[in-house]
């Protein structure tokens, strides 16, 4: 990929320039929802220019979209996964060094022509750990045109068994979206005990389908106060 690494003689100072305009000819991208989009602006210059991205003329920040985005500097690319209608707009790459600046704009249209099941932000909920007596929060970021039903579920044991006679796991719904539930995307656990350790599942559904992701909670023993003898606790599960 010649356009990815452009080496210049250190004495030959040069403002940024495009190295592969063929890859930039398609300015309008109409993409079905939930697909991945990749915009490229292969460039060169000396010193090697930097690249930044704007959305609709303003700085494009990770928090501007669920799931964020990836920038592959060595490939001069911007990657957005699982695009949604709110991703529509103009995306401008700005490539600059001390000798100049160039830019190129792509227009993204997200074609949303069929209802779809919920999409969950990758990496959430995230694994967490806390000490006995501590507090912890799990977050599940959901995208769905149709506001989904959100459930927080934990695997539990009954009579020392994790599975019922039917071979299915014992599950407990800890929280679900509804009239009496505030901010169902967040599960807060307070004053945790070792029994709270385990897998927590965020399960969302709308009338099209479901999605679920899980995270693990590790509960650590409380640190002993300085100067005190270490206490011994034996736990049998």
């Amino acid at each position: 990929m010649a356009e990815d690494f452009v080496s210049e003689n250190s004495n030959n100072k040069r403002a940024p320039y495009w190295t592969n305009t063929e890859k930039m000819e398609k300015r309008l991208h109409a993409v079905p929802a939930a697909n991945t989009v990749k915009f490229r602006c292969p460039a060169g210059g000396n010193p090697m220019p930097t690249m930044r991205w704007l959305k609709n003329g303003k700085e494009f920040k990770q928090e501007h979209r669920i799931g964020g985005y990836k920038v592959r500097n060595q490939h001069w690319s911007l990657i957005m996964e699982s695009v949604v209608p709110s991703d529509k707009g103009n995306y401008t790459c700005v490539v600059e060094n001390e000798y100049g600046s160039i830019n190129h704009t792509y227009h993204l249209d997200v074609v949303e022509r069929s209802p779809h099941r919920p999409i969950l932000q990758a990496g959430l909920p995230a694994n967490a750990s806390t000490v006995v007596g501590g507090d912890v929060e799990f977050v599940c970021k959901v995208y769905s045109d149709a506001q989904p039903h959100i459930q927080w579920i934990k695997h539990v044991e009954k009579n020392g068994s994790k599975y019922g006679p039917d071979g299915l796991p014992y599950l407990k719904v800890l929280k679900h979206s509804g009239i009496n539930s505030s901010n169902a995307e967040v599960l807060a656990l307070f004053n945790v005990t070792e029994a709270d350790a385990g897998e927590y599942i965020c399960k969302v559904s709308n009338y099209i389908g479901q999605a679920n992701q899980s995270a693990w909670l590790t509960v650590l023993p409380k640190q002993q106060a300085p100067g005190r003898e270490k206490e011994h606790h034996h736990h049998h599960h």
Epitope: P115, D145, A146, G209, Q210
Partner: antibody, heavy 113, light 108 residues
Framework: QVQLVQSGAEVKKPGESLKISCKGS????????IHWVRQMPGKGLEWMGA????????TYSPSFQGQVTISADKSISTAYLQWSSLKASDTAMYYC??????WGQGTLVTVSS | DIQMTQSPSSLSASVGDRVTITCRAS???????SNWYQQKPGKAPKLLIY???NLQSGVPSRFSGSGSGTDFTLTISSLQPEDFATYYC?????????FGQGTKVEIK
Amino acid sequence: QVQLVQSGAEVKKPGESLKISCKGSGYSFTNYYIHWVRQMPGKGLEWMGAIYPDNSDTTYSPSFQGQVTISADKSISTAYLQWSSLKASDTAMYYCARGADIWGQGTLVTVSS
Amino acid sequence: DIQMTQSPSSLSASVGDRVTITCRASQDIDPYLSNWYQQKPGKAPKLLIYDASNLQSGVPSRFSGSGSGTDFTLTISSLQPEDFATYYCQQTTSHPYTFGQGTKVEIK
């Protein structure tokens, strides 16, 4: 192409059991709810319930809870609607639907003595 | 249960007319959680509009949907001969996913 194909028309007597089917093709069957909808002769649409084939999560309308059973066999991409004891009032066209956008052709169930 | 009340229950119109059908929910529902279907005699329902205002793929642009809260509207901007059918709204906010009773659009 994406489609749902339902089993053929049935003529049954009151008290008999019945299981009708809905086979999905052209898409990932486990990733969409299959809904069942009843339409009695000359009447409107009634939502009966739904199943998520991936984990067999099932939900019923209170009007149909205990009257019918919804199930699925994801290995053959097929959902089912069944009755253990039919009544004359079960005479209707029954549709399966993937979410909202893809519908089966319908199965006419006639219950008559 | 959330009840969906459609009006009118039937209407007569001519080709080229602008037709509006309304659906009222018995309680506030999310603006994105209503669908509109068209059904012709002996056929399965066909999705026209989903999530209140999104036109389903392949559906002519003369169909449009709008609304939020409790009131939802299906509009046919210029009625065509193939549009004579029965139209249903549906809420998908909460189980059971209830339908309206239907609006039959007949030729005047």
